[in-house]
């Protein structure tokens, strides 16, 4: 296969099992030169975009999407894509966020490290305006 744009990756800090009320940060990574990262939830119609992209390494850029207080409704499948002009990438594999009843308070360390780098999760369908990478509609529902 040929890949003009490398597939992004997604991870979650501090993990993918988060107590209710705690925070979680999704980290999307892609090549340098990314203008916009998009975090999608379940399907392509629900997403958040950011142009706050930092350079994680000489060959990699990243963006961070933070949920300050996780609710049960935040549980689900998340994936990243990015816009590197003039193209949108394929999706990352999916990462599943699990929300559990808090037992040790909002800063409880009872979480599992999470990242997605293979089909144990999934990549998926695609819908992104090649020429309008920021949050310009696309029947967008914001994630949080």
């Amino acid at each position: 296969q040929e890949e003009d744009l490398p597939r992004p990756s997604i991870s979650a800090e501090p993990g993918t099992v988060i107590p209710l009320g705690s925070h979680v940060t999704f980290v999307c990574r892609g090549p340098v030169g990314v203008q916009t990262f998009r975090l999608e939830r379940d399907s392509r119609s629900t997403y958040n975009d950011t142009e706050d992209v930092s350079q994680a390494s000489p060959s990699e850029s990243e963006a961070r999407f933070r949920i300050d207080s996780v609710r049960e409704g935040n549980a689900g499948l998340y994936r990243c894509i990015y816009y590197k002009p003039p193209k949108w990438s394929e999706q990352s594999d999916y990462l599943e966020l699990l929300v559990k009843e808090s037992s040790g308070g909002p800063d409880s360390p009872d979480t599992e490290p999470g990242s997605s780098a293979g089909p144990t999760q999934r990549p998926s369908d695609n819908s992104h305006n090649e020429h309008a990478p920021a949050s310009q509609g696309l029947k967008a529902e914001h994630l949080y």
Epitope: L5, W88, P119, S124
Partner: antibody
Framework: SVKESGGDLVKPGASLTLACTAS?????????MCWVRQAPGKGLEWIGC???????IYYASWAKGRFTISKTSSTMVTLQMSSLTAADTATYFC??????????????WGPGTLVTISS | ELDLTQTPASVSEAVGGTVTIKCQAS??????LAWYQQKPGQRPKLLIY???SLASGVSSRFRGSRSGTEYTLTITDLECDDAATYYC?????????????FGGGTELEIK
Amino acid sequence: SVKESGGDLVKPGASLTLACTASGFSFSDGYYMCWVRQAPGKGLEWIGCIHSSSGSIYYASWAKGRFTISKTSSTMVTLQMSSLTAADTATYFCARDSESYGYNPCELWGPGTLVTISS
Amino acid sequence: ELDLTQTPASVSEAVGGTVTIKCQASQTISNYLAWYQQKPGQRPKLLIYAASSLASGVSSRFRGSRSGTEYTLTITDLECDDAATYYCQCTYYGTTYVGGAFGGGTELEIK
């Protein structure tokens, strides 16, 4: 919708290019555009897919070398086939992954175009 | 290369009955599995995506499930119109492995 064209009767050893024309959606939205074939009385056989925005292309291992998938315009994907044999006789379908479902299922299918290889 | 083994190759069942079709993946493909129905001379129709989610407009008599690398399509309360060939497909396209493969198909005859 998607519609295939270019099916024909050709001789063994020949080459043929099929086209898949899209309407009602934009390639820039990043769909997997796939080619699938079906020999008479046989099952579905995946050939490969191209991601219409990123340009990534994926082939079945048996198709690498003789089959080439390309995006030739903002509304057209092609399948180039070479060194054709009787075993390549089939209806060739173009399919697009879903607008609204995850996990890339082929939701939109063309009617197919018949390729016959015979001397 | 990913392989999907679909069983049985053919099955005959009476109207009102239930039929179960299985698809065994040679490696882990998570929920990247779809089921299609195809009638003679027609294009395939998507029934199930993401292993167990019902496509829009498809009867709830069709149900998909997953156990590890084994996927099952169950059709209940069979109707004459269900006579068709059913295919599973891995819908993962990526670098870890290339999916796309279809199962061999199951021809369903309604008695």
